[in-house]
C-alpha cells in the first residue's frame, strides 16, 4: 500500500453476494423504472403517448432494435451474438440518452440517472462479454451531428422524438432482460 493510503478489505458475511447475472438484471430493472418515471412526465406534458403520427418522426431516427439475426430471441438464440448486440445497441442509444438530458423540467435528475445507469450497465456487460472485438463503438463525429440535427427540430418533433426514444429504449431493455435471463 503506498504511503498516505490505507487499504481495508470488506469481508463478505454469510449472505450470498450478488452474482453478475443478478446484478445486471437489477440494473436493467433500475433503468426501466427510470424510463417509466420519464415517460410519465412526457405523457402528462403532451399527447404524444396516444399519437398516431409516430411513423412520421420514426423515419428520422435510427433507434436500435432487436432482430431475429441478433440471436436474442428464443428461436435461434445465440448467447455470444446476442450479448454483442445488446452492448452495441446500448452504445448506440447513448447519443439519444444525451439528447434527453435537456428535455425534462421536473425530472432532470432522473434523466441523468437513466443516462449514467446505462453507462454502468454497459460496463457490467462488457465484463461478461468474451468477444469485445466484435463490438463496434459509434463514431463520435456522427453522434455529434445527429445530436445537432435532433436539437434543431421543431417543438412537436422534439416531443415526438423524446417519446420514441423512451419507448424504443424500454422495448430494447425488455428484450435484453429476457435474453440475459437465458444466459
Amino acid at each position: 500500500v503506498p504511503p498516505g493510503e490505507d487499504s481495508k478489505d470488506v469481508a463478505a458475511p454469510h449472505r450470498q453476494p450478488l452474482t453478475s447475472s443478478e446484478r445486471i438484471d437489477k440494473q436493467i430493472r433500475y433503468i426501466l423504472d427510470g424510463i417509466s418515471a420519464l415517460r410519465k412526465e412526457t405523457c402528462n406534458k403532451s399527447n404524444m403517448c396516444e399519437s398516431s403520427k409516430e411513423a412520421l418522426a420514426e423515419n428520422n431516427l435510427n433507434l436500435p432494435k432487436m432482430a431475429e439475426k441478433d440471436g436474442c430471441f428464443q428461436s435461434g438464440f445465440n448467447e455470444e451474438t446476442c450479448l454483442v448486440k445488446i452492448i452495441t445497441g446500448l452504445l448506440e442509444f447513448e447519443v439519444y440518452l444525451e439528447y434527453l438530458q435537456n428535455r425534462f423540467e421536473s425530472s432532470e435528475e432522473q434523466a441523468r440517472a437513466v443516462q449514467m445507469s446505462t453507462k454502468v450497465l454497459i460496463q457490467f456487460l462488457q465484463k461478461k462479454a468474451k468477444n469485445l472485438d466484435a463490438i463496434t463503438t459509434p463514431d463520435p463525429t456522427t453522434n455529434a451531428s445527429l445530436l445537432t440535427k435532433l436539437q434543431a427540430q421543431n417543438q412537436w418533433l422534439q416531443d415526438m422524438t423524446t417519446h420514441l426514444i423512451l419507448r424504443s429504449f424500454k422495448e430494447f431493455l425488455q428484450s435484453s432482460l429476457r435474453a440475459l435471463r437465458q444466459m
Epitope: 450478488l18 418515471a37 449514467m116
Partner: nanobody, 125 residues
C-alpha cells in the same frame, strides 16, 4: 495499517477493497466513529448511477470515488481537521438498487450488509 497520524490541513486517501465479492455491484459508504461518539456516515457512492453524497461536515474536503477495474473504492480526505479523528469503516449495501432512492439515506448504517474492519485516522499536530 496505513491510517495513523496526520497533521491538521494534511491529506490522506483511504481505500476499500473487497474479498469474496464484486464491490462495483454495491453502493458503498464510508463511516467513522470517534471515541465516545455514535458512528456517523460520511460519504457514499451508488453502484447504479455513480452518484455521490457527502455529510455536511466533510463537504468540499472529502471525495469518494470508485475504480471498478481494481474492485476498490477510495475516500480522499483533504484539509483534515482534529475533529476528523476517528476509526473509519467502509461498508457495502444494496440501498441504491431502487430507482428514485433517497440519496441521503445512504449514510444510515442499517442500509449496509457488509462492513470493513476499520482503520484509525488521527489528526493532530
Amino acid at each position: 495499517g496505513g491510517g495513523g497520524l496526520v497533521q491538521p490541513g494534511g491529506s490522506l486517501r483511504l481505500s476499500c477493497a473487497a474479498s469474496g465479492f464484486t464491490l462495483d455491484y454495491y453502493g458503498i459508504g464510508w463511516f467513522r466513529q470517534a471515541p465516545g461518539k455514535e458512528r456517523e456516515g460520511v460519504s457514499c457512492i451508488s453502484s447504479s448511477d455513480w452518484s455521490t453524497y457527502y455529510a455536511d461536515s466533510v463537504k468540499g474536503r472529502f471525495t469518494i470515488s470508485r475504480d471498478n477495474a481494481k474492485n476498490t473504492v477510495y475516500l480522499q480526505m483533504n484539509s483534515l481537521k482534529p475533529e476528523d479523528t476517528a476509526v473509519y469503516y467502509c461498508a457495502a449495501g444494496t440501498w441504491d438498487l431502487k430507482f428514485g432512492y433517497n440519496r441521503s439515506n445512504c449514510v444510515r448504517s442499517a442500509e449496509y450488509d457488509y462492513w470493513g474492519q476499520g482503520t484509525q485516522v488521527t489528526v493532530s499536530s
